[in-house]
Structures are given as structure tokens and as C-alpha cells.
């Protein structure tokens, strides 16, 4: 027999199939040109000393073979003695070590058996009613196909599935979608209606994330407020990476989980923009305000679960950075200015009424005045900070007020509103004899003492009514008692107390008269 022809004789070996697990498999035969054909197969097992024979039986019952030696691929023409227009049955017999192993048979019409291509190019992936939908352009001149898919997870082996018949310029497949694990898919095609024809190669991997992106396991901490009024938000724990199937472990697109940070600045609600979204890798600097920080995970199917963290406001206060002057027209605040064209946000809230919303005011962009100060004024009619109570004031600054991450804290302090001079006057001043020439003066704490850092000192004034001589005694703001000594018996005195702030002298309390009785010896 000639090597280019199918030999219509008995093959040169015994015909028994050993039935072993090794041997030839996955035989596929197809037309490769107008008159050329190709068959190829896989061989499982040791290849040394193996000879392969491609067997063919015609519809008439006559059979022939091609001897291919150790090759697992054979090309032949339509002149090789094999009928290409009628149905034939083909299989491979592999002979080795006096044993013959046989592949499964394929029955087909060779002329109609075209080598189909797998889905090529861009395979679009979407979610449809809890399932995965894949869609691709049908390869040129190959409309009419049967399509199969195989899929695996990081912990499972390949499972085969059927996409059903396709008959259009675009083909699609519905596949199972896993809730919590990534999957790798591959697709293959063959000619529709030719059961014996061969499958295409498997497509490139299609990597699909789980339906639910993983919960972002992160932890935040925040550094101390720096001298620039900003503090760094830091990530203490990175999000866990998704486990991927074998074919998706390179730079395979499609399975990525992206994490984003959504910042919400809770303080200063009158500013232009309260929220900002940025990538998780870009950890921002924050002002001393309170923030909510959400970590949002998303994949190709959209957003997944998120985590929300709360960053409390930095409560560190500077006692004297703010100067407040009250005039007949209204009140003006002064503080050390930032750069040119800075917008300030001034926020205040009554202390002890934290349940109420803070009052917020935004200034127009302003430059420092000649003394290097920034200012904010309001009229008496506005009623702002008009009540005689303690207010917590915070001032924020930004040269770019629409950029949430560029705000900084200028100062955080306390202020006693209204007529602090009168409201702060100490009450319940009482005088008790202490010794023959001294008395103890006590008073109730000033309302100013409820306002941290506002009360600078008490001053106790004692006037000798005989000589009109006056002495003043400064007292620490934490004390509400002083001893007056070197007093003379039988002389009338008056005592008054006032409470002073750093920028305001208080009003004297009502005069309290007393005298030390003259001791009469028996």
C-alpha cells in the first residue's frame, strides 16, 4: 500500500483491544482545504515504541487504514481512497508492546466536517436573572454551531456544560454563577447537526468574579492632628484578595475587585460638598472634623457589600487662638489667617446641647488683613451666639472648598456668648470669720467655668470703708474661696468678686458688708 492512500488490507497486528485506561482519544477529522483533510488525536500514556493506525470503514462495509507511526496527526486528500461525500466511521488503533488500544469512533461526512474555531476576541459577560450570560461574535463563515462550556473554581476540577444550538451572527451561553467564589470558563464550538464532527479548541479563559464581591475586611486608624490642622487616615488591615482558579492567576481581566473609599465630612454641613469617593490606595488627610468613611467593594457586576467606619472629631482645643469683640453693631471674630483666598467654615454649638445641630457659616474667600488675621462678623439681630451660655466653636479652612480632602482645622475653642461680663458674675458670695484678723470668702462658681479655657481668673476686691483703701486678690479659675488677712477688728469692709476672661473684665458681684468683732477680754 502507498503511504498517501488508505490501505484496504488487514493491519499488521492482532486486533484485540486491551481496554486499558491509556491509549488514543479525542479523535477529530475535518476538511482543511477544498480537497485536503486532516485527522488528529491525543495519546495518553508512555509514547515510546507506539505505532498509530487510523482506521476507516466506508458505508459499504469495506475498511482500510493509514499507518502514521508515532505521529498523532495525518493529512490526506480526497484521492486517498476514503469517501469524503458519504458517511464514514473513523477510529485510531495504537499498537505497543504486543497490545492494541483503540479510541472511540467518530462517524461523519468528511466534506461537510469543517474545523470550527472557538469563540475569539471579546467575550462579553453579564448577569441575567441570577445566571451568567456570555456573548460573542460568531467567527466568520461559521454560523450554525453547537457550543459547550467547561468551568472550574479554585477548589474544583472542570465541569462540562452545554450552551445549546446557535444560529446567528452572535452566539451566547447561559452558565451558572457562583455567589462567593471566582470561576474560570472556556468555550468550544462545532458544526451544528454533525454529531461526529470535531470540537474546536477551547477558547481562552473567561474569568468571572463571584456574584457578591468579598466583604472588605479593613481597619482604620487616624493619626493626631498636625500643626497644619490635618490628620492622616491610615489603613491598618488591607482587604483580603480573592482566591482565583488556575487559568485566572495571571493578569486575567474580569475578576478584579476594586475597593473605593467614600468620605463623608459630618462637620460643617453648609460647605459645598460633603462627600468624596477615592481609591482605597489613596489614603487621604482629614481635618479634625468628624467623618464617616465607607469602604465600597465592586466587581464587573456592580457594587457589593460595604463597611462604614466613624472617625470622631478631634476635640483638642486651643484656648486663646480666637479673639471675639462685641460692639454696638455686632460681634466680630478674629483668628490667625491661612493663605490668600481661603474659605473658612465657622461652626458653633451650645455645650451640653449636643443633641442640637451645630450652626454653620461659610465665609467668602478672604485674604489675611494687615495684622495677618481672618475675620467673621455678624449683627446682634442675627441672634448668633447671643444666649448667655457656653459655645464650642470650630473653624475649618480650605483654599479649595469643593475638595473635601483639602479642608483643615484652624482652631477649636470655647466661647461664652451673650453678655458674658454680667452672666459670669459670681453669686452667693459669703464671708466667714477665719481668725482674729482674717476672713474666708466663698462664692458659687461662675457660669464661665462651665466653658473650658474661658475663665482666666477670679478677682476678689476688699474695701476698707473707713479709709476707702482697696485691695484686689487674683484667684485661680479652679478655686472658689480665698482668705483675706491683716484685717482690723471693728472696721467695716465690703467684699466683691468678679470673673475675668482673657479678653473681658467681668462685672463685680453685689457688695457684701462684714466686720470682725472686737474681742473684749474679761
Amino acid at each position: 500500500c502507498r503511504t498517501s492512500e488508505c490501505c484496504f488490507q488487514d493491519p499488521p497486528y492482532s486486533d484485540a483491544d486491551s481496554g486499558s485506561a491509556s491509549g488514543p482519544r479525542d479523535l477529530s477529522c475535518y476538511r482543511i482545504s477544498s480537497a485536503g483533510y486532516e485527522c488528529s488525536w491525543q495519546y495518553e500514556g508512555p509514547t515510546a515504541g507506539v505505532s498509530h493506525f487510523l482506521r476507516c470503514c466506508l458505508s459499504s462495509g469495506r475498511c482500510c487504514y493509514f499507518a502514521t507511526g508515532s505521529a498523532t496527526r495525518l493529512q490526506f486528500s480526497d484521492q486517498a481512497g476514503v469517501s469524503v461525500l458519504h458517511t464514514v466511521t473513523l477510529w485510531v488503533e495504537s499498537w505497543a508492546r504486543n497490545r492494541t488500544e483503540k479510541s472511540p469512533e467518530v462517524t461523519l461526512q468528511l466534506y461537510k466536517s469543517v474545523k470550527y474555531k472557538p469563540p475569539l476576541g471579546d467575550i462579553k459577560v453579564s448577569k441575567l436573572a441570577g445566571q451568567l450570560r456570555m456573548e460573542w461574535e460568531t467567527p466568520d463563515n461559521q454560523v450554525g454551531a453547537e457550543v459547550q462550556f467547561r468551568h472550574r473554581t479554585p477548589s474544583s476540577s472542570w465541569k462540562l456544560g452545554d450552551c445549546g444550538p446557535q444560529d446567528d451572527d452572535t452566539e451566547s451561553c447561559l452558565c451558572p454563577l457562583e455567589m462567593n467564589v471566582a470561576q474560570e470558563f472556556q468555550l468550544r464550538r462545532r458544526r451544528l447537526g454533525s454529531q461526529g464532527s470535531s470540537w474546536s479548541k477551547w477558547s481562552s479563559p473567561v474569568c468571572v468574579p463571584p456574584e457578591n464581591p468579598p466583604q472588605p475586611q479593613v481597619r482604620f486608624s487616624v493619626e493626631q492632628l498636625g500643626r497644619d490642622g490635618r490628620r492622616r487616615l491610615t489603613l491598618k488591615e488591607q482587604p483580603t484578595q480573592l482566591e482565583l482558579p488556575e487559568g485566572c492567576q495571571g493578569p486575567a481581566p474580569g475578576v478584579e475587585v476594586t475597593y473605593q473609599l467614600q468620605l463623608h465630612m459630618l462637620s460643617c454641613p453648609c460647605k459645598a460638598k460633603a462627600t468624596r469617593t477615592l481609591p482605597l490606595e489613596k489614603m487621604p488627610y482629614l481635618s479634625g472634623a468628624a467623618y464617616n468613611v465607607a469602604v465600597i467593594s465592586s466587581n464587573r457586576f456592580g457594587p457589593g457589600p460595604n463597611q462604614t467606619w466613624h472617625i470622631p472629631a478631634d476635640t483638642h482645643t486651643e484656648p486663646v487662638a480666637l479673639n471675639i469683640s462685641v460692639g454696638t453693631n455686632g460681634t466680630t471674630m478674629y483668628w490667625p489667617a491661612r493663605a490668600q483666598s481661603t474659605t473658612y467654615c465657622i461652626e458653633w454649638q451650645p455645650v451640653g446641647q449636643e443633641g442640637s445641630l451645630a450652626t454653620c457659616n461659610l465665609t467668602a474667600p478672604q485674604d489675611p488683613d494687615p495684622a495677618g488675621m481672618a475675620t467673621y462678623s455678624w449683627s446682634r439681630e442675627s441672634g448668633a451666639m447671643g444666649q448667655e451660655k457656653c459655645y464650642h466653636i470650630t473653624i475649618f479652612a480650605s483654599a479649595h472648598p469643593k475638595k473635601l480632602t483639602l479642608w483643615s482645622t484652624v482652631l477649636s475653642t470655647y466661647h461664652f456668648g451673650g453678655n458674658a461680663s454680667a452672666a459670669g458674675t459670681p453669686h452667693h458670695v459669703s464671708v466667714k470669720n477665719h481668725s482674729l484678723d482674717s476672713v474666708s470668702v466663698d462664692w458659687a462658681p461662675s457660669l464661665l467655668s462651665t466653658c473650658p479655657g474661658v475663665l482666666k481668673e477670679y478677682v476678689v476686691r476688699c474695701r476698707d470703708e473707713d479709709s476707702n483703701q482697696v485691695s484686689e486678690h487674683p484667684v485661680q479659675p479652679t478655686e472658689t474661696q480665698v482668705t483675706l488677712s491683716d484685717l482690723r477688728a471693728g472696721v467695716a469692709y465690703t467684699v466683691q468678686v468678679r470673673a475675668d476672661t482673657a479678653w473681658l473684665r467681668g462685672a463685680w458681684s453685689q457688695p457684701q458688708r462684714f466686720s470682725i468683732k472686737v474681742q473684749v477680754s474679761d
Partner: nanobody, 126 residues
């Protein structure tokens, strides 16, 4: 110590409304924030709403946003959860939780909170 007592749970028809309350007593001056969580039979505990005691800023998950509203009355030391357009999947035991102190914490995690109530049961029938 802080004690939290929930009330106001009950049976309601789908589409209906209910308001549950949580009264706090004890060292309530230390309260920084309050939250509601819920647990349906056989499911994990789920975050429902969060409110800052100062200023009243609120946070909700997507599942209840627009239907539920958390509010508080500082004078009464009480936090409320107003639930509208109720669905059968809202059926659960609702717990309130209190946060003391001013550290960074996760709003939607049960473990972030310092004190918890015993819960009040809400059943939504279809």
C-alpha cells in the same frame, strides 16, 4: 453601666408601619452613638441604622434606606426606629446598641458597640 430596653415590636401587615423605641438608663452621659441591628431566624445579625448622639448624623444600609428612620430624644435618653413600607423580609428581632467613648469604630459591626438591649420582635405578615 448602661441599660437598654427595647419596646414597640409586634405583628404588622406588609406595607404597614411600626415604631420601636429603646430607652437608655444608667451612665447615659457617656453615650456617643446609638444603633439598631436585627436578626432574622437562622440568619446573621444585620446592621439597620446608626445615629450620633451629638448632632444626629445618621447612616443606613441600602436594604432599609428610604423606608426606615432613626431618631433620638436626648432629654428622654431614647432612640427610635420608625419603620415604613414594611416587607416580610423585615421580620426579625430588633436590638439597639450603645457606643461610649470617642475612638474610631465600625458603624455597621455589632462588635463595635459597648451595650446591647434584649431585643423586640417584629413580624411582618404578607
Amino acid at each position: 453601666e448602661v441599660q437598654l430596653v427595647e419596646s414597640g415590636g409586634g405583628l404588622v401587615q406588609a406595607g404597614g408601619s411600626l415604631r420601636v423605641a429603646c430607652a437608655a438608663s444608667g451612665r447615659t452621659f457617656s453615650t456617643y452613638a446609638m444603633a439598631w441591628f436585627r436578626q432574622a431566624p437562622g440568619k446573621e445579625r444585620e446592621f439597620v441604622a446608626h445615629i450620633l448622639w451629638s448632632g444626629g448624623s445618621t447612616v443606613y444600609p441600602d436594604s432599609v434606606r428610604g423606608r426606615f428612620t432613626i431618631s433620638r430624644d436626648n432629654a428622654k435618653n431614647t432612640v427610635y426606629l420608625q419603620m415604613n413600607s414594611l416587607k416580610p423580609e423585615d421580620t426579625a428581632v430588633y436590638y439597639c446598641a450603645q457606643k461610649s467613648g470617642r475612638q474610631v469604630y465600625r458603624i455597621d459591626s455589632w462588635d463595635s458597640f459597648d451595650y446591647w438591649g434584649q431585643g423586640t420582635s417584629v413580624t411582618v405578615s404578607s
